[in-house]
């Protein structure tokens, strides 16, 4: 094995090209200069290396950059990124959104891997906050990204970033997360007129307090039942029958189908039967 450590005559790689796929593992190790590999990283993704060969190439980069790869290399990793461990990625300092996008593209269409989660964490921590461009990028690749953050992490999201959030990005958020996001959304959308405001704020209403729901009930918003069912129970309970009727508009008839489910069930039990009867839905308090 010892004699195999020297590169055979005439096999020294002058560039990263397809001839390297015929090299054995030990030949790649001995004949490919790590610095050459680093400068021609973008070529690797167009060459059908085996998984074993990729392990060798990664090992060479690890030896060249024991403290972590520079961003110029990271940006061109392509599918070699999928060979990185979270421990490798923690050594990186990724500051460019273009680099982040390039690496997210490699994993596109698949669940967030530990590598991607670590990469995002490093990137966001490096920026200090989750700015609009970053949030735009992350939710484009991972619609559920926002809801994967803790309430503490969400507190660092500036209100201006809320404009990037789409309704589907909030599908898996729990009430604690919406409690943090709602005030930010309210602030972000405060200068919009009534109907436009409601369209934007609707997805965040699971964090709205009673007084805001009362205010919305005065604006003919016609909230659908799906949104109503996601409201905080403690925010719905103090609402009067008249307020709920105004809030839901023509959708009020949907209360009957949801009468056994929270928050409708708990709200019904808090109302006077005479008031419920005015709805003509046969709701029993």
């Amino acid at each position: 094995e010892v004699e195999k450590t020297a590169c055979p005559s005439g096999k020294k790689a002058r560039e990263i090209d397809e001839s390297l796929i015929f090299y054995k593992k030990w030949e790649l190790e001995a004949c490919v200069d790590a610095a050459l590999l680093a400068t021609q990283m973008d070529r690797v993704n167009a060459i059908p290396f085996t998984y074993e060969q990729l392990d060798v190439l990664k090992h060479k980069l690890d030896e060249l950059y024991p403290q972590g790869y520079p961003e110029s290399v990271i940006q061109h990793l392509g599918y070699l990124f999928l060979k990185m461990s979270p421990e490798d990625i923690r050594k990186w300092n990724v500051t460019s959104l273009e680099t982040l996008k390039a690496l997210l593209e490699v994993n596109k269409g698949h669940e967030m891997s530990p590598q991607v989660a670590t990469l995002i964490d490093r990137f966001v921590k490096g920026r200090g906050q989750l700015d609009k461009d970053t949030l735009d990028t992350l939710t484009a690749f991972y619609p559920g990204y926002l809801c994967s953050l803790s309430p503490e992490e969400l507190s660092s999201v500036p209100p201006s970033s809320i404009w990037a959030v789409r309704p589907q990005d909030l599908d898996t958020c729990d009430p604690r997360q919406l409690d943090v996001l709602y005030p930010k959304a309210r602030l972000a959308f405060q200068n919009m007129n009534g109907s436009e405001y409601f369209v934007k704020i609707q997805s965040f209403l699971g964090g709205a307090p009673t007084e805001d729901l009362k205010a919305l009930s005065q604006q003919n918003v016609s909230m659908d039942l799906a949104t109503f069912m996601k409201l905080r129970t403690d925010a719905v309970l103090p609402l009067t029958v008249a307020e709920v009727q105004k809030l839901l508009g023509p959708h009020v008839e949907g209360l009957k189908a949801e009468e056994r489910h929270r928050p409708v069930r708990d709200w019904i039990l808090r109302q006077r039967q005479d008031d419920l009867d005015t709805l003509g839905l046969g709701l029993q308090g």
Partner: antibody, heavy 119, light 107 residues
Framework: QVQLVESGGGVVQPGRSLRLSCAAS????????MNWVRQAPGKGLEWVAV????????YYADSVKGRFTISRDNSKNTLYLQMNSLRAEDTAVYYC????????????WGQGTLVTVSS | DIQMTQSPSTLSASVGDRVTITCRAS??????LAWYQQKPGKAPKLLIY???SLESGVPSRFSGSGSGTEFTLTISNLQPDDFATFYC?????????FGQGTKVEIK
């Protein structure tokens, strides 16, 4: 020579689970990725999942995400497919197949094992 | 996800014919395309990889061409053993997608 032998197929009720195995020989199993591909009766081929050589990278077709889990035991030269919450549309012959790199085709295939999901 | 569309779905031909099967990708896949042959009750067999490279042991009457989104498999002198179903497949770092198949049957 390369040999891949699937096992574990059979008849199972909807909602139940099944685990398929694929025993590999004739090559360095720990060096290559392994795939599962299925073929419903009278239909075409559908790629199901892949697991890279070291076992940490796993990718799935949308149709099985969250229900199927691919895994491997390199010490036993064996590939697995854990299939949960089975549906009638999962009825198919399941093949295991090898690929040698991210930009390599499926060069060796097993003979397949039939999974029938029926009540 | 990348979709692969094969045409025709069925092809009737005679021994000695030259047949061509087309495969179209929904987005560019460079040259990362393979062709497989499958006979009833058997596993698929790799014929062509990287769009035009012939797998070891495959007769030279099989050839492939194309890049980007348009690919073709040609059988130059159809033999009795060639009547089967043929599939194209794109492959990249983590997913593979097959075309729906083309059945080559005896005319």
């Amino acid at each position: 020579q390369v040999q891949l032998v699937e096992s574990g197929g059979g008849v199972v009720q909807p909602g139940r689970s099944l685990r398929l195995s694929c025993a590999a020989s004739g090559f360095t199993f720990s060096s290559d990725a392994m795939n599962w591909v299925r073929q419903a009766p009278g239909k075409g081929l559908e790629w199901v999942a892949v697991i890279w050589n070291e076992g940490s990278n796993k990718y799935y077709a949308d149709s099985v995400k969250g229900r199927f889990t691919i895994s491997r035991d390199n010490s036993k030269n064996t590939l697995y497919l854990q299939m949960n919450s089975l549906r009638a549309e999962d009825t198919a012959v399941y093949y295991c197949a090898r690929d040698r790199g991210p930009l390599w085709p499926l060069d060796y295939w097993g003979q397949g094992t039939l999974v029938t999901v029926s009540s | 996800d990348i979709q692969m569309t094969q045409s025709p779905s069925t092809l009737s031909a005679s021994v000695g014919d030259r047949v061509t099967i087309t495969c179209r990708a929904s987005q560019s896949i460079s040259r990362w395309l393979a062709w497989y042959q499958q006979k009833p009750g058997k596993a698929p067999k790799l014929l062509i990889y990287k769009a035009s490279s012939l797998e070891s042991g495959v007769p030279s009457r099989f050839s492939g061409s194309g890049s980007g989104t348009e690919f073709t498999l040609t059988i130059s002198n159809l033999q009795p053993d060639d009547f089967a179903t043929f599939y194209c497949q794109q492959y990249n770092a983590y997913s593979r997608t097959f075309g729906q198949g083309t059945k080559v049957e005896i005319k």
